[in-house]
C-alpha cells in the first residue's frame, strides 16, 4: 500500500523558520504534490503549494520556496513571520496524486516537544487518504 | 475576447504610493491567477509577485516583499497592486498577466497580457 | 533565483532566413520555459509555453525545443513583423525568471 509520511522541522538558527518535508512511498509515478495547512486539501486546509513534476512549481504565502528533493520527494520552507514559533500548533498535509494509484494524503505537525532542528517522525499520522 | 485593461499612466512624488488596476473580461476572473511584472531598459523584466482571485492567496519575489501589496476584487473583475514608498528605482513600466490555475489542462504560461501603465516616480 | 541567460543581446537577419535564439538555465528546469515576443511599445505576446507548444494563433515558422537546461526559439523563413525582443521565461520554481531579451533586427 502506498504511503505518505510528513516531516515538518524547525531550523535550529531561526526559531520562526519552518520547513515541510513530505515524500511518497510507493510505486507509482508521482502525477502532482498538494500542500496544504490547517487541514487537507479541499477539507478547510489552505493551499500552500503545488509541485509538477514537469511543469514546475507554484506557491502561496507564507510558503517562500518549494521544491522537489527526489523525484518522489518534496520540501517547502515557511516564510519568517518575525513571531517565536507561528506554524508551532499548526498542521500540515500533503497530499500525493501518482498513477495508476490514485491520491494519498498525510498531515502532520510540529512535536510540541520538539527542540530546534528535531523534526517529527517520518510515518503518517491517522489522517491519511485514499481518494 | 480576453482583455486586461490597466489603469493609465502615472506621475508621483518619491516616498508616495500609488495603486494601479487592471480590469479583466472576457473569462472568468477567478480561473486564472493575476501576476504583476515590472518592465526596466536596466533590469528588463522582473516578476514581481502573484495573486488567485479565487482565494486570495499571494506569492511574491523577495525582492519586492514590502514593496507591492497584490489584491483583487471579484465584484469587478479587477486586481490591484499597490506600490509603497516609491523612488526613482520603482519608474517602470508595470504589466498585469494572466496564468492558468489548472494543471489539468497543462498550459501553465502567461496568455495575455495587460498593455501596461507606466509610472514615473520624480519630485 | 534560477537564472535564465540569453547571451546574445542581438541577432542580425534577413527576410527570409533561418534564426535561433537560445536561453540557458542555470539550473534543471524540465520542461517549464515560455517564449514571449515584444516589439516597441507593446505589451510581451505569448508565443511557446511547455518548451516546444505554440500558443495559439502563432504561425508555425515560430518552433521552441529543449529541456534542462538548454532551449531555443527558431523562427524559420524570418518576416519583416518577426523584428522585435524575445524573451524566456522559467515557471519551475518561484520567483519566475526571465532572459534579459535578445532584440532581431535586421542586417
Known amino acids: 500500500t502506498p504511503e505518505v509520511w510528513v516531516q515538518v522541522q524547525m531550523e535550529a538558527t531561526e526559531l520562526s523558520s519552518f520547513t515541510v518535508h513530505c515524500g511518497f512511498l510507493g510505486p507509482g509515478s508521482i502525477s502532482l504534490v498538494t500542500v496544504s495547512w490547517g487541514g487537507p486539501d479541499g477539507a478547510g486546509g489552505t493551499k500552500l503549494a503545488v509541485l509538477h513534476p514537469e511543469l514546475g512549481t507554484r506557491q502561496w504565502a507564507p510558503a517562500r520556496q518549494a521544491r522537489w528533493e527526489t523525484q518522489s520527494s518534496i520540501s517547502l520552507a515557511l516564510e519568517d513571520s518575525g513571531a517565536s514559533s507561528p506554524f508551532a500548533n499548526t498542521t500540515f498535509c500533503c497530499k500525493f496524486a501518482s498513477f495508476p494509484e490514485g491520491s494519498w494524503e498525510s498531515c502532520g505537525s510540529l512535536p510540541p516537544s520538539s527542540d530546534p532542528g528535531l523534526s517529527a517522525p517520518p510515518t503518517p499520522v491517522p489522517i491519511l487518504r485514499a481518494d | 475576447q480576453v482583455q486586461l485593461q490597466q489603469s493609465g499612466a502615472e506621475l508621483v512624488r518619491p516616498g508616495a504610493s500609488v495603486t494601479l488596476s487592471c480590469k479583466a473580461s472576457?473569462?472568468?476572473?477567478?480561473?486564472?491567477?493575476m501576476h504583476w511584472v515590472k518592465q526596466t531598459p536596466v533590469h528588463g523584466l522582473e516578476w514581481i509577485g502573484a495573486?488567485?482571485?479565487?482565494?486570495?492567496?499571494?506569492a511574491y519575489n523577495q525582492k519586492f516583499k514590502g514593496k507591492a501589496i497584490l489584491t483583487a476584487d471579484k465584484s469587478s473583475s479587477t486586481a490591484y497592486m499597490e506600490l509603497r514608498s516609491l523612488t526613482s528605482e520603482d519608474s517602470a513600466v508595470y504589466y498585469c498577466?494572466?496564468?492558468?490555475?489548472?494543471?489539468?489542462?497543462?498550459?501553465?504560461?502567461?496568455?495575455?497580457w495587460g498593455q501596461g501603465t507606466t509610472l514615473t516616480v520624480s519630485s | 533565483d534560477i537564472v535564465m541567460t540569453q547571451s546574445q543581446k542581438f541577432m542580425s537577419t534577413s527576410v527570409g532566413d533561418r534564426v535561433s535564439i537560445t536561453c540557458k538555465a542555470s539550473?534543471?528546469?524540465?520542461?517549464?520555459v515560455a517564449w514571449y515576443q515584444q516589439k516597441p511599445g507593446q505589451s510581451p505576446k505569448a508565443l511557446i509555453y511547455?518548451?516546444?507548444n505554440r500558443h495559439t494563433g502563432v504561425p508555425d515558422r515560430f518552433t521552441g525545443s529543449g529541456s534542462g537546461t538548454d532551449f531555443t526559439l527558431t523562427i524559420s523563413n524570418v518576416q519583416s513583423e518577426d523584428l522585435a525582443d524575445y524573451f524566456c521565461?522559467?515557471?519551475?520554481?518561484?520567483?519566475?525568471?526571465f532572459g534579459a531579451g535578445t532584440k532581431l533586427e535586421l542586417k
Open positions: 498577466t494572466r496564468w492558468i490555475t489548472t494543471v489539468v489542462a497543462t498550459l501553465y504560461y502567461f496568455d495575455y
Open positions: 472576457g473569462y472568468t476572473f477567478t480561473d486564472y491567477e
Open positions: 495573486i488567485d482571485p479565487e482565494t486570495g492567496g499571494t
Open positions: 539550473q534543471n528546469v524540465r520542461t517549464a
Open positions: 511547455l518548451a516546444s
Open positions: 521565461l522559467q515557471h519551475w520554481n518561484y520567483p519566475l525568471t
